[in-house]
């Protein structure tokens, strides 16, 4: 899978994590920090 950093318009897309652009899947993906979950790392689960 080809990945790159998200475009600058997606700054702030991931609330508690890093935004990655999955090129072949045509979508952004949030790699969440420890303790966070959700599509945009918006939920704290500890």
């Amino acid at each position: 899978v080809s990945i790159t950093k998200c475009n600058s318009d997606m700054n702030g897309y991931c609330l508690h994590g890093q935004c990655i652009y999955l090129v072949d899947m045509s979508q952004n993906y949030c790699r969440c920090e420890v303790g966070y979950t959700g599509v945009r790392c918006e939920h704290f689960y500890l």
């Epitope: 790159t4 475009n7 318009d9 997606m10 702030g12 090129v23 045509s26 979508q27 952004n28 599509v39």
Partner: antibody
Framework: QDQLVQSGAEVKKPGASVKVSCKAS????????IQWVRQAPGQGLEWMGR????????KYREKFEGRVTITADTSTNTAYMELSSLRSEDTAVYYC?????????WGQGTLVTVSS | DIQMTQSPSSLSASVGDRVTITCKAS??????IAWYQQKPGQAPRLLIQ???TLQPGVPSRFSGSGSGTDYTFTISSLQPEDIATYYC????????FGGGTKVEIK
């Protein structure tokens, strides 16, 4: 199956306002950004602005600033675009577009006609 | 706002011809460009995103290339069903469409 279903065609008088809705199904709008694009008859595509329903922030194209308002109701999974002080040049098809989790998934479009 | 200058605005070519459309951005858009095809009365259809990534179901005669501020969209062998208007879209910093290119058959 993911869908963006927009409200029906509108006819408005110059100076009036119009509010177009965009109801999402199959996904949560809080996971996305909702963009709005318009296309006047025989003209090109024009980006108007976008809403982040989770954070609640909005960005607009400069030319529409002060005249367009993009909102979202996360309880009904619906986004809205309101354009005020309508003029004949605002006659166009207005599209909502989902981005973020999936690159640019479009609604079917809503024709807004401004005529006296 | 980033400006996108698309050229030509229209072109006429024969079936089987190679067709090239260019888009120039007013600043580096880091390969964040998409290409759409629009036929009359229809919503735009995404063909390519991130400069060169073809969407599922899109014929391989369509391709894209470029970097920095200069990008190219190519139809390697024009087919009758390719008659449409094509738009570039930068999505690096907010969004801006190019002015469109109407492709016709000679």
């Amino acid at each position: 199956q993911d869908q963006l279903v927009q409200s029906g065609a509108e006819v408005k008088k110059p100076g009036a306002s119009v509010k177009v809705s965009c109801k999402a199904s199959g996904f949560n709008i809080k996971d996305t950004y909702i963009q709005w694009v318009r296309q006047a008859p025989g003209q090109g595509l024009e980006w108007m602005g976008r809403r982040d329903p989770l954070r609640g922030n909005t960005k607009y194209r400069e030319k529409f600033e002060g005249r367009v308002t993009i909102t979202a109701d996360t309880s009904t999974n619906t986004a809205y675009m309101e354009l005020s002080s309508l003029r004949s040049e605002d006659t166009a098809v207005y599209y909502c577009v989902r981005s973020g989790t999936l690159f640019d998934f479009w609604g079917q479009g809503t024709l807004v006609t401004v005529s006296s | 706002d980033i400006q996108m200058t698309q050229s030509p605005s229209s072109l006429s070519a024969s079936v089987g011809d190679r067709v090239t459309i260019t888009c120039k951005a007013s600043q580096d858009i880091h390969k964040y460009i998409a290409w759409y095809q629009q036929k009359p009365g229809q919503a735009p259809r995404l063909l390519i995103q991130y400069t060169s990534t073809l969407q599922p179901g899109v014929p391989s005669r369509f391709s894209g290339s470029g970097s920095g501020t200069d990008y190219t969209f190519t139809i390697s062998s024009l087919q009758p069903e390719d008659i449409a208007t094509y738009y570039c879209l930068q999505y690096d910093n907010l969004r801006t469409f190019g002015g469109g290119t109407k492709v016709e058959i000679k």
